[in-house]
């Protein structure tokens, strides 16, 4: 299965004055995604 996440666009939000955060990359760097580029338990976003 194709991974819908893309490092080139990692990061959900950047607002000056806010702490930097990478919600997208949390999924990319999850235990699940390390096990399998697929469906446990983060399947491709519908």
């Amino acid at each position: 299965l194709a991974d819908p996440l893309d490092h080139r666009d990692a990061g959900d939000l950047w607002v000056p004055g806010e702490s930097e955060s990478f919600e997208d990359a949390h999924v990319e760097h999850s235990i699940s995604r390390s096990l399998l580029e697929g469906e446990i338990p983060f399947p491709p976003t519908s």
Epitope: D9, G11, D12, E23, S32
Partner: antibody, heavy 114, light 112 residues
Framework: EVQLVETGGSLVQPGKSLKLTCATS????????MHWVRQSPEKQLEWIAH??????????YYAESVKGRFTISRDDSKTTIYLQMNSLKEADTAIYYC?????WGQGVMVTVSS | DTVLTQAPLSVSVTPGESASISCRSN???????????LYWYLQKPGKSPQLLIY???NLASGVPDRFSGSGSETDFTLKISEVETEDVGVYYC?????????FGPGTKLELK
């Protein structure tokens, strides 16, 4: 099978230190971002620390409530993360979980009391 | 900080009936690429939290499709279409968009 096993919890006096360990197995560890989340006796969940991977220079982030007192670290060769807790306060009393946000450990109890 | 509030804080449901839990954020959780960073967890009695829903509406693997998540930028709903005995516990919403990451206070689901 994915396993996250926290150890090191105990009863300690205010001002003392404690180090928690989270031993992981069952998944490729080195690229995973890990967190510590704690749960107060009132059952409120609080995210307290986050460590990224080597490719991200092991960047760390902390909640204000623990910044300067707690240190998160990892040893990729041992597939383990740590939480060094210094200057403990009674308000730090909680169950401490290590998590990848998808999988969670069973938790370990830390009680800070005189 | 991003504050999450939940309602109700406690709900009693007859098995087989539906239940809805609300989560509201004081800030938008809509990030880039139209990804909404709202997660739902269930903590069963005596257990660790388990992931149910990620990115507002995506079902985690192994979670029954009786569970569904929906919402907008700041208002979110977890629906359980036909509550079963195993659904008892405390439901938490969480956001992983802005530091510090935050959780809601939890909603306790009990059976009538």
């Amino acid at each position: 099978e994915v396993q996250l096993v926290e150890t090191g919890g105990s009863l300690v006096q205010p001002g003392k230190s404690l180090k928690l360990t989270c031993a992981t197995s069952g998944f490729p560890f080195s690229n995973v971002w890990m967190h510590w989340v704690r749960q107060s006796p009132e059952k409120q969940l609080e995210w307290i620390a986050h460590i990224k991977a080597k490719s991200d220079n092991y960047a760390t982030y902390y909640a204000e409530s623990v910044k300067g007192r707690f240190t998160i670290s990892r040893d990729d060769s041992k597939t383990t993360i740590y939480l060094q807790m210094n200057s403990l306060k009674e308000a730090d009393t909680a169950i401490y979980y290590c998590t990848g946000l998808d999988y969670w450990g069973q938790g370990v109890m830390v009680t800070v009391s005189s | 900080d991003t504050v999450l509030t939940q309602a109700p804080l406690s709900v009693s449901v007859t098995p087989g009936e539906s239940a809805s839990i609300s989560c509201r954020s004081n800030k938008s959780l809509l990030g880039i690429r139209d990804i909404t960073s709202l997660y739902w967890y269930l903590q069963k009695p005596g257990k660790s939290p388990q992931l149910l829903i990620y990115r507002m509406s995506n079902l985690a693997s192994g979670v029954p499709d009786r569970f569904s998540g929906s919402g907008s930028e700041t208002d979110f709903t977890l629906k359980i279409s036909e509550v079963e005995t195993e659904d008892v516990g405390v439901y938490y919403c969480a956001q992983f968009l802005r530091y510090p990451y935050t959780f809601g206070p939890g909603t306790k689901l009990e059976l009538k």
